[in-house]
C-alpha cells in the first residue's frame, strides 16, 4: 500500500529483568523528514481525542529537547531512515507493546513492536542433528533469542558437567531480520558418549551462571565386544580342545547377528556366542575374533592368536645368493615349520656336519672357491627333531687365476716386425669366454687368446692381456723393448732468442725426442750441401745470404731420420732502394706518371715516404706514387725512403722530366 510507511525490525524482542534491549529498525516516511517521534508503552488509540494514550518512554520534538528521565531509553535513529532504539536497563514491566509514533510534516504513523521481558534469564535452546553416529563429526548448536550491545553474555558447553575441550564458534545477530546469540560446536562423538548429558550454559560477562539447556546424547554405534579364551594363553598342542566366548559390552541399536572369523575369513556354521574347537590340528593355528552386527554395522572383538604346537617339519635351505662371487658374503637360512620355533639346528656341508653351527642362519663373510657344494640342515624344538631335507647347491664364481702374457717372438724386436703374444691362465669359473689386450690397437687375434701385431710400432712399449669370464683378470705387462731409428728430429734455434738480424751470432741445435739404441750420429745440410757433423750448427756473423732451408739428420744402428726443412730467415733494414718510373723518366704533361719505390728488405717495407727535390715529404704512404695529371712543374728529382721493423733505407735521386704537350707548344 503506497499510503503506508515502510518499517523493518524484528517482530518480537526478548530480554530479562536488568538486561537491555537493542531494537534494530529502519523506516521510510511517506513524505519529507521526521519531525516528531514518541515511543509509547502499550499505546491505545483514544477516539475522542484522536490521539494515542499510554506511557511515554521517549519523546523528541522539533526543538530536540528530551526530558532527563528518558535516559534509560535512547532513540539512535535519524530523520529519514534509521529508527533503532535501545532500552538499558530493561525491566519486567517493559513487557508488552512498544509503539513508535512518527510524524512528518503532513503524515503520521504508529508502528508496533512486541517486547517480552522475563523475570529471570530464559534458557538457550540446544539443537542436535537428527542422528549421531560414533566418529562422525556433528555440529551442536546452542541458540538464544537475545543480543544487546550493552549487556555482553557468553555460551559455554559442558559434557557431564565438565567444560568441553573443543573450540566453539559464537556468533551474534543484531539486524532488522533477527536478534540472537548462537554457539556452534564441532564434535566427533565416540560410542562411550552414548547417554551422556551435554549442557549449554548461559553466563554473563564475568562467567556467572544465568541459565542453561541440557540434552542426552544418543550415539549410534556398532557393537563393542570382549573375547575370552580357555586356556587363557591360547597355546595348545595338537589334539587339545579350545573354547572361545564373545561378550557384548555395548550396542546401539541392539545387535542382530553373531559370527566368528579366523585370519579374517568367516567360519561357517559358527553363529553363537561360544566357539568350541575339539582335537585341534596345527592348521587351526591363527588369529580368531568374533563379529556382532547391528543396524549401524559390524563390530569386531580384539584378535586371539591361537598357537597349536608341533615338532619341526623336514627342513629346506635357502641361500642368499647363489651363484656367489668369490670374496662376497653368503647367508644360509634353515627353513622348517615348527611351533614353538626351533631352538637348535645342525648344519651339513657336502654331507659332513659343520662343527659349531647351531643357529638358524649361517653367515660366511668372505666366500672362497672351496666353499662351493651342497648345504643341508636339521631343526629341533621341545617337541622333537625334524628330518634333513634335500639341501641347496652353492656355486662360487671367481675371475680367471694366474693370468700371464707370453711373447712368442725371438728377441730383440725391431720397429716394423710382426709380434705374436699369447694369454695364459690357470683356472676360471665360469669358463673364459674372451680376452682383452692393453693398449688397444688395430691388431689381429688369429685365435682365442693369441694376439698378432703386424708392423710393430716404436712406441709399443708394453702389452698386457686379460682373460675374461664375468670378470677380467689382467696379467702383468710385458715389455716389447722395440728398437727404432731416432724420432722427432727437428731444428731448433738456440740463439738469438728473438728474431735473427743481419750480423747476429746464430746457433742451431739438432734435437730428437728418442732413439733405441741410444748411440747416434748427426749431420747438417743446406740445399743438399753437407755443412757439419755436430749436434749444433754455428754462425759467428749471419748475413742475408745465409738465409735458406736447413735440415739435420740423426742415425743409429736401426736407421736414420731427417728433420723437416727449417727456414733460416735473416731480418735486415731496407737496402738497394731505387725509384723506377712508368711509363719512363720522360712523360708528357697531362698524362699519368707512376713512381715505384723498389727495395730489398726483410721483413718487407711497412711504410714508404716520398720526397721531392727540396727534400719536402709528399703525402703518400704507398709503394707507388701516382701523378695524374702530371704537370711540367712536377719535373725534378724524387727519392723514396723505406721503413721496416729493423730500420730505414733511402734511394738515390731519380729525375722525372715532364715535357710540354704539342697543344701547349702550339699555344705559345
Amino acid at each position: 500500500d503506497s499510503s503506508k510507511w515502510v518499517f523493518e525490525h524484528p517482530e518480537t524482542l526478548y530480554a530479562w529483568e536488568g538486561a537491555c534491549v537493542w531494537i534494530p529498525c529502519t523506516y521510510r516516511a511517506l513524505d519529507g523528514d521526521l519531525e516528531s517521534f514518541i515511543l509509547f508503552h502499550n499505546p491505545e488509540y483514544n477516539k475522542n481525542t484522536s490521539k494515542f494514550d499510554g506511557t511515554r518512554l521517549y519523546e523528541s520534538t522539533k526543538d530536540g529537547k528530551v526530558p532527563s528521565e528518558q535516559k534509560r531509553v535512547q532513540f539512535l535513529g535519524d530523520k529519514n531512515k534509521n529508527c533503532t532504539l535501545s532500552i538499558h536497563p530493561v525491566h519486567l514491566n517493559d513487557s508488552g507493546q512498544l509503539g513508535l509514533r512518527m510524524e512528518s510534516k503532513t503524515e503520521k504513523w504508529m508502528e508496533r513492536i512486541h517486547l517480552n521481558v522475563s523475570e529471570r534469564p530464559f534458557p538457550p535452546h540446544i539443537q542436535l542433528p537428527p542422528e549421531i553416529q560414533e566418529s562422525q563429526e556433528v555440529t551442536l548448536t546452542c541458540l538464544l533469542n537475545f543480543s544487546c550491545y550493552g549487556y555482553p553474555i557468553q555460551l559455554q558447553w559442558l559434557l557431564e558437567g565438565v567444560p568441553m575441550r573443543q573450540a566453539a564458534v559464537t556468533s551474534t545477530s543484531l539486524t532488522i531480520k533477527s536478534v540472537f546469540t548462537r554457539s556452534e560446536l564441532k564434535f566427533s562423538p565416540q560410542w562411550s558418549h552414548h547417554g551422556k548429558i551435554v549442557t549449554c550454559q548461559l553466563q554473563d560477562a564475568d562467567g556467572k551462571f544465568l541459565s542453561n539447556d541440557t540434552v542426552q546424547l544418543n550415539v549410534k554405534h556398532t557393537p563393542k565386544l570382549e573375547i575370552k579364551v580357555t586356556p587363557s594363553d591360547a597355546i595348545v598342542r595338537e589334539g587339545d580342545s579350545v573354547t572361545m566366548t564373545c561378550e557384548v559390552s555395548s550396542s546401539n541399536p541392539e545387535y542382530t547377528t553373531v559370527s566368528w572369523l579366523k585370519d579374517g575369513t568367516s567360519l561357517k556354521k559358527q553363529n553363537t556366542f561360544t566357539l568350541n574347537l575339539r582335537e585341534v590340528t596345527k592348521d587351526q593355528s591363527g588369529k580368531y575374533c568374533c563379529q556382532v552386527s547391528n543396524d549401524v554395522g559390524p563390530g569386531r572383538s580384539e584378535e586371539v592368536f591361537l598357537q597349536v604346537q608341533y615338532a619341526p617339519e623336514p627342513s629346506t635351505v635357502q641361500i642368499l645368493h647363489s651363484p656367489a662371487v668369490e670374496g662376497s658374503q653368503v647367508e644360509f637360512l634353515c627353513m622348517s615349520l615348527a611351533n614353538p620355533l626351533p631352538t637348535n639346528y645342525t648344519w651339513y656341508h657336502n654331507g659332513k656336519e659343520m662343527q659349531g653351527r647351531t643357529e638358524e642362519k649361517v653367515h660366511i663373510p668372505k666366500i672362497l672357491p672351496w666353499h662351493a657344494g651342497t648345504y643341508s640342515c636339521v631343526a629341533e624344538n621341545i617337541l622333537g627333531t625334524g628330518q634333513r631335507g634335500p639341501g641347496a647347491e652353492l656355486d662360487v664364481q671367481y675371475p680367471p687365476k694366474k693370468v700371464t702374457t707370453v711373447i712368442q717372438n725371438p728377441m730383440p724386436i725391431r720397429e716394423g716386425d710382426t709380434v705374436t703374444l699369447s694369454c695364459n691362465y690357470n683356472s676360471s669359473n665360469p669358463s673364459v669366454t674372451r680376452y682383452e689386450w692393453k693398449p688397444h690397437g688395430a691388431w689381429e687375434e688369429p685365435s682365442l687368446g693369441v694376439l698378432k701385431i703386424q708392423n710393430v710400432g716404436w712406441d709399443n712399449t708394453t702389452i698386457a692381456c686379460a682373460a675374461c669370464n664375468s670378470w677380467c683378470s689382467w696379467a702383468s705387462p710385458v715389455a716389447l723393448n722395440v728398437q727404432y731409428a731416432p724420432r722427432d728430429v727437428r731444428v731448433r734455434k738456440i740463439k738469438p732468442l728473438s728474431e735473427i738480424h743481419s750480423g747476429n751470432s746464430v746457433s742451431l741445435q739438432c734435437d730428437f725426442s728418442s732413439s733405441h739404441p741410444k748411440e747416434v750420429q748427426f749431420f747438417w745440410e743446406k740445399n743438399g750441401r753437407l755443412l757439419g757433423k755436430e749436434s749444433q750448427l754455428n754462425f759467428d756473423s749471419i748475413s742475408p745470404e745465409d738465409a735458406g732451408s736447413y735440415s739435420c739428420w740423426v742415425n743409429n744402428s736401426i736407421g736414420q731420420t731427417a728433420s723437416k726443412a727449417w727456414t733460416l730467415e735473416v731480418l735486415y733494414a731496407p737496402r738497394r732502394l731505387r725509384v723506377s718510373m712508368s711509363p719512363g723518366d720522360q712523360v708528357m704533361e697531362g698524362k699519368s706518371a707512376t713512381l715505384t719505390c723498389e727495395s730489398d728488405a726483410n721483413p718487407p717495407v711497412s711504410h714508404y715516404t716520398w720526397f721531392d727535390w727540396n727534400n719536402q715529404s709528399l703525402p703518400y704512404h704507398s709503394q707507388k706514387l701516382r701523378l695524374e695529371p702530371v704537370k711540367v712543374q712536377h719535373s725534378g728529382a724524387y727519392w723514396c725512403q723505406g721503413t721496416n721493423s729493423v730500420g730505414k733505407g733511402r734511394s738515390p735521386l731519380s729525375t722525372l722530366t715532364v715535357y710540354y704537350s704539342p697543344e701547349t707548344i702550339g699555344r705559345r
Partner: antibody, heavy 127, light 111 residues
C-alpha cells in the same frame, strides 16, 4: 682556431658545372704539412672522398677514380681559398659537399686524418 | 674501391660500453695505421674522434678509444651518455688511386 667556410649554389641543372669554394682562416693553403680535400655525402653512396690539392715545392692534386676526368681543384693563394669544379653533373651527384683539412704531420711523425671540416653545402642536381 | 664494412646499428644503456667494428682489407685497414673515426650528429659536419688507429685529438673525451687487429678496426665508447647518440664513420688511407675510403656508417642509439 682553423675554420673552413664554404660557399656556392645549392641547385645545379643536369650537364652543367658544379662550383664550390672553401675559404681558409687560421691556416695557409700553402702549408707544407697539410692537404686540402673535398668530400661528399649522399644516402646512396655514404661518405666519398673526391680529391685533394696541396703545395710542397709545387702544386699537386689527386682525384678519386669515380670522378677523375670531370673534376678539378683550383687554388687562389691571394684569397687563401680553394675550389671544386665538377663538370657534366647528373642527379647521382646530388648530396652534401664538404671541404676538409688533412693535417699530415703529428709532431715528428706521420699522421693522416680529416681534423677540420667545413659546414657543408647541400647540392641538388635537378632540371 | 668498396666501402669499409660497419654494422648498421648499435645500442647500449647509459653507463654501459659499446664497440663498433670496421672491416676492410690488407690494402686499407690491414695495410696502414691510418684509421680514423668520425662522429656526425643530424644536420652537422662529421667531427674527428680518433686518428691513426688509437690517438685522441685534444678536446675529445677519454671515454672514446680505438684499436686494430688484422683487417678490422674498432671504436669503443665506455660510460655511454645521451649525447653520444649519433652516426659513426671509420676511414682509412688506401693503396688504390682513390686515396681514402670511408665506412658504411653505424647509427648508435642510447637506450
Amino acid at each position: 682556431e682553423v675554420q673552413l667556410q664554404q660557399s656556392g649554389p645549392g641547385l645545379v641543372k643536369p650537364s652543367q658545372t658544379l662550383s664550390l669554394t672553401c675559404a681558409i682562416s687560421g691556416d695557409s693553403v700553402l702549408s707544407n704539412s697539410d692537404t686540402w680535400n673535398w668530400i661528399r655525402q649522399s644516402p646512396s653512396r655514404g661518405l666519398e672522398w673526391l680529391g685533394r690539392t696541396y703545395h710542397r715545392s709545387t702544386w699537386y692534386d689527386d682525384y678519386a677514380s669515380s670522378v677523375r676526368g670531370r673534376v678539378s681543384i683550383n687554388v687562389d693563394t691571394s684569397k687563401n681559398q680553394y675550389s671544386l669544379q665538377l663538370n657534366a653533373v647528373t642527379p647521382e651527384d646530388t648530396g652534401v659537399y664538404y671541404c676538409a683539412r688533412d693535417r699530415l704531420q703529428d709532431g715528428n711523425s706521420w699522421s693522416d686524418a680529416f681534423d677540420v671540416w667545413g659546414q657543408g653545402t647541400m647540392v641538388t642536381v635537378s632540371s | 674501391q668498396s666501402a669499409l664494412t660497419q654494422p648498421a646499428s648499435a645500442s647500449g644503456s647509459p653507463g654501459q660500453s659499446v664497440t663498433i667494428s670496421c672491416t676492410g682489407t690488407s690494402s686499407d685497414v690491414g695495410g696502414y695505421n691510418y684509421v680514423s673515426w668520425y662522429q656526425q650528429h643530424p644536420g652537422k659536419a662529421p667531427k674527428l674522434m680518433i686518428y691513426d688507429v688509437s690517438n685522441r685529438p685534444s678536446g675529445v673525451s677519454n671515454r672514446f678509444s680505438g684499436s686494430k687487429s688484422g683487417n678490422t678496426a674498432s671504436l669503443t665508447i665506455s660510460g655511454l651518455q645521451a649525447e653520444d647518440e649519433a652516426d659513426y664513420y671509420c676511414s682509412s688511407y688506401t693503396s688504390s688511386s682513390t686515396l681514402y675510403v670511408f665506412g658504411t656508417g653505424t647509427q648508435l642509439t642510447v637506450l
